[in-house]
């Protein structure tokens, strides 16, 4: 806590600019008034203050501000952001997405923090929902923002937002979360013709039924090895070896270098050798010919 | 190396103003504040202001404010300072200096004046 | 306003040692610096951060402060040495000088 001092003769600011950059923490605190401060925020990001002095500066808008800034101080926080903790944004009420993306730019460039997690995890629940705007804005900064959300709260982006989401923003995504995206996305791109949706719904496949990817095999999208490694081994074993070479096109030779691994692996044994044959890739370990294979609640090979 | 080199004497009537010109080489000239010191004949020195070359951030003494202006030209490594409504008691001759801020962990303070103009002699007279 | 004080003048034999003081409130607390001015010409830095010499300032030059006054100490003073002596010190962000010492050399 700094001492409460009377400001030394001739040093009461006037206005924040760049001489309260030489002030001691205890000047600053006697010489700065919190209104003053409040008023003028704008110029503190152009200021190159120290870590200690931007203490002094928050303790004086917390002691103005017991319940929370207003989003007129907020907007104009600069990199006094960074020294907000999340008890202080959860008293805050942002509405602004000019706010937002303000407070955003400060973080630019850094791992999301405890207190960007808590700004946006404020911003949205103000919302009710995740708009494209917001989206946009979110994903932009964070390219990796979808994934870090449960697939509960992925369930309040609306299908108009998926416009706003780039392939390197699904990167870390699991198999949950895309299973609610696909369907969004599924429904925003629906009104695109065949090679214009497939490059568009290619990145969510991850979340894709066995009956949309048969549908795709119809198509002749030519599916490329890292997007087909990255489908739900569900969906892909029931498809045939027909379906999956005219799902992978010209690629379909890439399996021969990924047969070891999911969900190649568990495919190829759930075709028969016979089929496999006809890729001429070499791939190895589906059922012998002459036996019959039984879809019950377990696989079996029974002969 | 490291010089400042400022224009020539003035003489300008009362309630006129001067500019005062200030050329930095041999030195980032943005990397220092200039600091601007005159001295009237046979007095003290007496501190006028510093601007920051770099932000273009000021800060003028009591003494002067509302009369001086001190502006740069970071393309020409120029400072300058201008004085309004002049008297007879601005006669003197006036000094730019450069001066390093140093971040210290609490706050910035000032080092010395290492280095200053040849002075400009500027007089006031009806 | 901040102010310091400095003796008018000061006057030494040559190779004696000369002592100009400057005082000031809490003086100790700050940062001091003296220059050296010579007639017709600008002021030098003889002493910084109160006690430090820059290069080529003779060693001869020396400061000390604490309390209410620092002090700038010429030893072994030559008659080169006779010139206007200048302390100053920052308050906060503006700087403050004393009415200089005149230092003559006897």
């Known amino acids: 806590e700094v001492e409460k001092t009377a400001c030394p003769s001739g040093k009461k600011a006037r206005e924040i600019d760049e001489s309260l950059i030489f002030y001691k923490k205890w000047e600053l605190e006697a010489c700065v008034d919190a209104a003053l401060l409040a008023t003028q925020m704008d110029r503190v990001n152009a200021i190159p203050f120290t870590y200690e002095q931007l203490d002094v500066l928050k303790h004086k808008l917390d002691e103005l501000y017991p319940q929370g800034y207003p989003e007129s101080v907020i907007q104009h926080l600069g990199y006094l952001f960074l020294k907000m903790s999340p008890e202080d944004i959860r008293k805050w009420n942002v509405t602004s997405l000019e706010t937002l993306k303000a407070l955003l730019e400060v973080n630019k460039g850094h791992e999301m923090s405890p207190q960007v997690a808590t700004l946006i995890d404020r911003f949205v629940k103000g919302r009710g929902q995740l708009d494209k705007d917001t989206l946009d804005t979110l994903t932009a900064f964070y390219p990796g923002y979808l994934c870090s959300l449960s697939p509960e709260e992925l369930s309040s982006v609306p299908p108009s937002s998926i416009w706003a989401v780039r392939p390197q923003d699904l990167d870390t995504c699991d198999p949950r979360q895309l299973d609610v995206l696909y369907p969004k996305a599924r429904l925003a791109f629906q009104n695109m013709n065949g090679s214009e949706y497939f490059v568009k719904i290619q990145s969510f496949l991850g979340g894709a039924p066995t009956e949309d990817l048969k549908a795709l095999s119809q198509q002749n999208v030519s599916m490329d090895l890292a997007t087909f490694m990255k489908l739900r081994t569900d969906a892909v074993l029931p498809l045939t070896v027909a379906e999956v070479q005219k799902l992978l096109g010209p690629h379909v030779e890439g399996l021969k270098a990924e047969e070891r691994h999911r969900p190649v692996r568990d495919w190829i044994l759930r075709q028969r050798q016979d089929d496999l044959d006809t890729l001429g890739l070499g791939l190895q370990g589906g059922i012998p010919n002459g036996y019959l294979v039984l879809d019950l609640s377990m696989q079996e090979a029974l002969s | 190396q490291v010089q400042l080199v400022q224009s020539g004497a003035e003489v300008k009537k009362p309630g006129a103003s001067v500019k005062v010109s200030c050329k930095a080489s041999?030195?980032?000239?943005?990397?220092?504040?200039i600091h601007w010191v005159r001295q009237a004949p046979g007095q003290c020195l007496e501190w006028m202001g510093w601007i920051n070359p770099n932000s273009g951030g000021t800060n003028y003494a009591q003494k002067f404010q509302g009369r001086v202006t001190m502006t740069r030209d970071t393309s020409i490594s120029t400072a300058y300072m201008e004085l309004s409504r002049l008297r007879s008691d601005d006669t003197a001759v006036y000094y730019c200096a450069r001066v390093e801020a140093v971040a210290g962990r609490e706050y910035y303070y000032f080092s010395g004046m290492d280095v200053w103009g040849q002075g400009t002699t500027v007089t006031v007279s009806s | 306003s901040y102010e310091l004080t400095q003796p008018p003048s000061v006057s030494v034999s040559p190779g004696q040692t000369a002592s100009i003081t400057c005082s000031g409130e809490k003086l100790g607390d700050k940062y001091v610096y003296w220059y050296q001015q010579k007639p017709g010409q600008s002021p030098v830095l003889v002493i910084y951060q109160s006690t430090k010499r820059p290069s080529g300032v003779p060693e001869r030059f020396s400061g000390s402060n604490s309390g209410n006054t620092a002090t700038l100490t010429i030893s072994g003073t030559q008659a080169m040495d006779e010139a206007d002596y200048y302390c100053?010190?920052?308050?906060?962000?503006?700087?403050?000088f004393g009415c200089g010492t005149k230092l003559t050399v006897l």
């Open positions: 041999g030195y980032t000239f943005t990397g220092y504040y």
């Open positions: 100053q010190a920052y308050h906060a962000s503006t700087a403050v």
